[in-house]
């Protein structure tokens, strides 16, 4: 399906307010620091030339690729190597290395300020004075922020943006109208960025036999009733969406997955009853939806599955003739009857059904070797089992706080190397599947909490590739991503780590923490217990306890004095002292 | 363990031809993507062409229009044909599988197996 002018192909497919906000967010994930003011320049050439293009598609470099158009702009920004280093050594290569360069500078932690919410009545004002350029604000301050945000989702919260500001900005009340929106999709969208990055680390760093692999499992828990076929177009429909996306290719990205949405809303019976809801509604919510859909129930009639996998004598044969095929379908089979297990524990017991074939299916009798392979699944499946009964237990004994303060305890006497700010971070997310998953029925909690830390971890995993501190982080994160998660869980105290040495500066405390939010607080106190841990890493639980609860006191005593910073400077060395003498 | 063997480099003149083939050890091969790359002298190892396992091909700008990979999975070999060879196609040529099949195709961490390389020389 050639075009003889891509840009214009995709300017006409995607209409123009797709195509600007689509090229603002690629330039804004590529030059993550460039000023608003210069991506909005950069779109609005580009979207120009596109103009020309689909006027006469035999004009001047309409034939030229997408990369070579997009890369030959960004490389027009005059400040690239003051601002970037050695990015601007892309612009001194070909396509597709250059394009393929720029991806590989995307800062998944750009050293950009935090964004600070004006007052709603600052926000409604600048609304309505240019609500192009207040969306469009919003588009670049989330893409450069979160370089591999997935494009045509972003689209969708910069759709539902505009529609919370348009609804509030004339109620009564605005700001208990707006707030409680523009908290929803902050969280929506640190959680959608969270999981497109997995997904194209996992594209990138295991290929895209995992993301397959992956997309089977998930595919088939939602689509019980399609059948492997069906299953198997929408995964490499799917995989070629996400590898686009992920590849920086945002225009084609969009344009293939409006495609896979029209496809599964013209075959909804051949998928399933669980998506009709979604097909009446408008593109980018449609998508939204098709991707956010409920599992449809499981066939009533599926028979055992060692019939074909355990009992055959033909496994091995069925195996030989298409190995990715045969397995493929045992992943689908297991999967669609097992919405209760979690995708990444579906894809542990495919990986050692596959290689009890291959030991089996070279041996003498093969059918009395692999005969007790489903016996082996047993263990797998009760390791996530048991974690997530235990944490689960332990969330509704602690609470939330307690909770990721204990995680961050384990996670620093394990990891002691990390950046205290990304063990923080981390072992905070970590820490919210237990209201995120705790409270579901048995039958949901492993896929919610299991596949949430596998985005967790993968975030752990990004940050440490860029600053890589810890050999156990760089092993866990590498050997195989279905694994991650139990390779984190088996890691024991550091024996080999040297102590930080103590700090009295990290420990020392001022008046401003008074005036900080709750959360900034915690942020404040989980960063002391880090500090603490990393330099007694043998401290137990109790020890850690009275030393936080002596903190927690002091801190409010000396925000109820009348002369806050005297006594900050008057209890701190007391309470250091005391903190030192307690875990002496 | 894949091995990959190199064949075809070597002397030819500007503007003349090469077929350079790399053979596979494992019937996988024609489950993995392939690629050529290519060091000169004193320069870093540049991405020349891929091949997707269903086919697909991409190739670096300068070498677009006169460089063809392709491949055969009955023979578990990889192809790629050098027309209108130039002086600074000078390199030693290198064959990559990666089993897992990548997305990033031009970088070079994203292959499993390397060959040991060819010589092509193009003297004026």
């Known amino acids: 399906d050639t075009h003889k002018s891509e840009v214009a192909h995709r300017f006409k497919d995607l209409g123009e307010e797709h195509f600007k906000g689509l090229v603002l967010v690629a330039f804004s994930q590529y030059l993550q620091q460039c000023p608003f003011e210069e991506h909005v320049k950069l779109v609005n050439e580009v979207t120009e030339f596109a103009k020309t293009c689909v006027a006469d598609e035999s004009a001047e470099n309409c034939d030229k690729s997408l990369h070579t158009l997009f890369g030959d702009k960004l490389c027009t920004v005059a400040t690239l190597r003051e601002t970037y280093g050695e990015m601007a050594d892309c612009c001194a290569k070909q396509e597709p290395e250059r394009n393929e360069c720029f991806l590989q500078h995307k800062d998944d932690n750009p050293n950009l300020p935090p964004l600070v919410r004006p007052e709603v009545d600052v926000m409604c004002t600048a609304f309505h004075d240019n609500e192009a350029t207040f969306l469009k604000k919003y588009l670049y301050e989330v893409a450069r922020r979160h370089p591999y945000f997935y494009a045509p989702e972003l689209l969708f919260f910069a759709a539902r943006y505009k529609a919370a500001f348009a609804e509030c900005c004339q109620a009564a009340d605005k700001a208990a109208c707006l707030l409680p929106k523009l908290d929803e999709l902050r969280d929506e969208g640190k959680a959608s960025s969270a999981k497109q990055r997995l997904k194209c680390a996992s594209l990138q760093k295991f290929g895209d036999r995992a993301f397959k692999a992956w997309a089977v499992a998930r595919l088939s828990q939602k689509f019980p009733k399609a059948e492997f076929a069906e299953v198997s177009k929408l995964v490499t429909d799917l995989t070629k969406v996400h590898t686009e996306c992920c590849h920086g290719d945002l225009l084609e990205c969009a344009d293939d997955r409006a495609d896979l949405a029209k496809y599964m809303c013209e075959n909804q019976d051949s998928i399933s009853s669980k998506l009709k809801e979604c097909c009446d509604k408008p593109l980018l919510e449609k998508s939204h939806c098709l991707a956010e859909v409920e599992n449809d129930e499981m066939p009533a009639d599926l028979p055992s599955l060692a019939a074909d996998y355990v009992e055959s004598k033909d496994v091995c044969k069925n195996y030989a003739e298409a190995k990715d095929v045969f397995l493929g379908m045992f992943l689908y089979e297991y999967a669609r009857r097992h919405p209760d297990y979690s995708v990444m524990l579906l894809l542990r017991l495919a990986k050692a059904y596959e290689a009890t074939l291959e030991k089996c299916c070279a041996a003498a009798d093969p059918h009395e070797c692999y005969a007790k392979v489903f016996d082996e699944f047993q263990p797998l499946v009760e390791e996530p089992q048991n974690l997530v009964k235990q944490n689960c237990e332990l969330f509704e004994q602690l609470g939330e706080y307690k909770f990721q303060n204990a995680l961050l305890v384990r996670y620093t006497k394990k990891v002691p190397q990390v950046s205290t700010p990304t063990l923080v971070e981390v072992s905070r997310n970590l820490g919210k599947v237990g209201a995120k998953c705790c409270k579901l029925p048995e039958a949901k909690r492993m896929p919610c909490a299991e596949d949430y830390l596998s985005v967790v971890l993968n975030r752990l995993c990004v940050l440490h590739e860029k600053t890589p501190v810890s050999e156990k982080v760089t092993k866990c994160c590498t050997e195989s991503l279905v694994n991650r998660r139990p390779c984190f869980s088996a890691l024991e105290l550091d024996e080999a780590y040297v102590p930080k040495a103590f700090n009295a500066e990290t420990f020392t405390f001022h008046a401003d923490m008074c005036t900080l939010s709750e959360k900034e607080k915690q942020v404040k106190k989980q960063t002391a217990l880090v500090e603490l841990v990393k330099h007694k890493p043998k401290a137990t639980k109790e020890q850690l306890k009275g030393v936080m609860d002596n903190f927690a006191a002091f801190v409010e005593k000396c925000c109820k004095a009348d002369d806050k910073e005297a006594c900050f400077a008057e209890e701190g060395p007391k309470f250091v002292a005391a903190s030192q003498a307690a875990l002496a | 363990q894949v091995q990959l063997v190199e064949s075809g480099g070597g002397l030819v003149q500007a503007g003349g031809s090469l077929r350079l083939s790399c053979a596979a050890s494992?019937?996988?091969?024609?489950?993995?993507?392939m690629a050529w790359f290519r060091q000169a002298p004193g320069k870093e190892r540049e991405f020349v062409a891929h091949i997707h396992w269903r086919g697909s091909t991409t190739y670096l700008d300068s070498v677009k229009g006169r460089f063809t990979i392709s491949r055969d999975n009955a023979k578990n070999t990889v192809y790629l044909q050098m027309n209108g060879l130039r002086l600074e196609d000078t390199a030693v040529y290198y064959c990559?599988?990666?089993?897992?099949?990548?997305?990033?195709?031009?970088?070079?961490?994203?292959?499993?197996?390397w060959g040991q390389g060819t010589q092509v020389t193009v003297s004026s």
């Open positions: 990559a599988a990666d089993s897992a099949r990548r997305i990033l195709v031009t970088v070079s961490t994203s292959y499993d197996y």
């Open positions: 494992e019937r996988a091969f024609s489950h993995s993507n």
